[in-house]
């Protein structure tokens, strides 16, 4: 008699997963000397411990904690590259940039990257069929209190000039609701932290308009004003151009504003 | 059927090194991991170290580190338990143990067991 | 590394007997806990695994509890097969460790 499970809005653990984050932190730990010391069995056993055999929806930072403590990674403080509905983008700059990092170019954030995964309560069972959602069922889910966890302690890490790349093709180029602005804006440290500084990237060629001037990103400001850390803002017009001056800088054309 | 087929027992000097085959048949090799564990005359299991072929990355107790090299032959689906710098108190039966990858279960299959008798 | 303690050591039972053993954990290992039943010259046998999900093929008088760090093997009527010698096995982090055993004898 098939056993009843719950289903869940969201899609299932990502097919072979712990193969995947098995085999990325291998390919982490041989291309970073220094997390060479990590084992990536143990890795594995600390991710499992956190979500496997718990109700998907009653997931706690602390279930990460062990996973925490054994991928603990020192990056420079001050080269953290922060970003927001802009993925994609900001881990090319980083490609190019070696010594900035998103949160993607640490351990954990590598192993996670684009992978959905959940457990079923009292079952030592991957559930590859569905996951919950974080608006249509739960939002202490095991993917979502990852990434919280992940990305508060990464932002508590920032310090002096800390840089954020925003989409300004978007609605709201400032979320309130996304990860950047639920958890990191309000976990720098300003003892740490003198400035943050947004990049907001322009998605039409034609595109002249100062979107530092949008009213999010005035909220943005007010926010982090008031947690006392300065605040700036630059329009990046041409993200291709962008890119391309990061990787030549110089080319004759990138003396003007890109 | 799954069946783990160990080498036959090995009669060692104190100081030389010795390598165990745990030959694996009825299964995909590569979905699994295995594990060695051995067992001294009388005594209880203690486990040694894991290799996860598809990896082929191993780790080992801290006990055995610097003295044990664990890898797997994927063509031949066997893995290997290299022992080196015997002492007496090596002598036990050496079993190889297979468990899935993720570590979510059980060893559930074990090798027959190999000797290894460590005597000057 | 997890030290696993297992009680008794020893016992002697009769066909028929409930046996129960325990397996203490030195820390909390959630559910990842295994037990084996070994018999003389034999390599072990999965009987539990995840503290109470019973390995196929094994007799439904094995059971297992427990989590955390207290455990429980219990065989509800012993038969004359069952005479063996049982470990219990963390797998929540390595190093693996096994209790040190519990051998079950014929009173």
């Known amino acids: 008699v098939p056993r009843w499970r719950q289903q869940w809005s969201g899609p299932g653990t990502t097919k072979r997963f712990p193969e995947t984050v098995l085999a990325r932190c291998v390919k982490y730990t041989e291309i970073h000397p220094e997390m060479r010391h990590v084992d990536c069995q143990s890795v594995w056993d600390a991710f499992k411990g956190a979500f496997i055999s718990k109700h998907p929806c009653n997931i706690t930072e602390e279930d990460y904690q062990p996973l925490m403590k054994l991928g603990t990674q020192t990056v420079p403080c001050n080269k953290i590259l922060l970003w927001s509905r802009i993925k994609d983008l900001a881990h090319q700059f980083t490609q190019v940039q070696r010594d900035m990092f998103t949160l993607e170019d640490t351990l954990l954030g590598y192993l996670a990257d684009d992978l959905t995964w959940c457990g079923e309560f009292n079952t030592s069972k991957i559930n590859y069929q569905s996951c919950p959602d974080w608006r249509k069922d739960c939002s202490n889910n095991p993917v979502s209190v990852f990434w919280k966890t992940v990305s508060r302690r990464f932002a508590e890490a920032a310090c002096d000039v800390v840089h954020v790349m925003l989409n300004g093709s978007r609605s709201k180029i400032f979320d309130k609701n996304s990860t950047f602005g639920s958890v990191e804006v309000h976990n720098l440290q300003p003892e740490k932290v003198q400035t943050l500084e947004a990049w907001v990237i322009h998605g039409g060629r034609e595109d002249s308009r100062d979107l530092c001037q949008d009213p999010t990103i005035k909220e943005l400001e007010s926010i982090i004003s008031k947690r006392n850390i300065q605040f700036s803002c630059k329009n990046i017009y041409r993200p291709d151009k962008f890119l391309q001056c990061v990787k030549n800088p110089e080319d004759s054309s990138c003396t003007s504003e890109i | 059927q799954v069946q783990l087929v160990q080498s036959g027992a090995e009669v060692k000097k104190p100081g030389s090194s010795v390598k165990v085959s745990c030959k694996a048949s009825?299964?995909?090799?590569?979905?699994?991991?295995f594990s060695w564990v051995r067992q001294a005359p009388g005594q209880g299991l203690e486990w040694m170290g894991r290799?996860?072929?598809?990896?082929?990355?191993?780790n080992s107790a801290q006990k055995f580190q610097g003295r044990v090299t664990i890898t797997a032959d994927k063509s031949t689906s066997t893995a290997y338990m290299d022992l080196s710098s015997l002492r007496s108190e090596d002598t036990a039966v050496y079993y190889c143990?297979?468990?899935?990858?993720?570590?979510?279960?059980?060893?559930?299959?074990w090798g027959q067991g190999t000797l290894v008798t460590v005597s000057s | 590394d997890i030290q696993m303690t297992q009680s008794p050591s020893s016992l002697s039972a009769s066909v028929g007997d409930r046996v129960t053993i325990t397996c203490r954990a030195s820390?909390?290992?959630?559910?990842?806990l295994a037990w084996y039943q070994q018999k003389p010259e034999k390599a072990p046998k999965s009987l539990i695994y995840?503290?109470?999900s019973l390995q196929s093929g094994v007799p439904s008088r094995f059971s297992g509890s427990g989590s955390g760090t207290d455990f429980t093997l219990t065989i509800s009527s012993l038969q004359p097969e069952d005479f063996a010698t049982y470990y219990c096995?963390?797998?929540?982090?390595?190093?693996?460790?096994f209790g040190q055993g519990t051998k079950v004898e014929i009173k």
């Open positions: 143990a297979r468990d899935d990858i993720a570590a979510l279960g059980p060893f559930d299959y």
């Open positions: 995840a503290a109470s």
């Open positions: 009825g299964g995909t090799f590569s979905s699994y991991a």
């Open positions: 820390q909390g290992i959630s559910s990842w």
């Open positions: 290799v996860i072929p598809f990896l082929g990355t191993a």
């Open positions: 096995q963390q797998y929540n982090s390595y190093p693996r460790t």
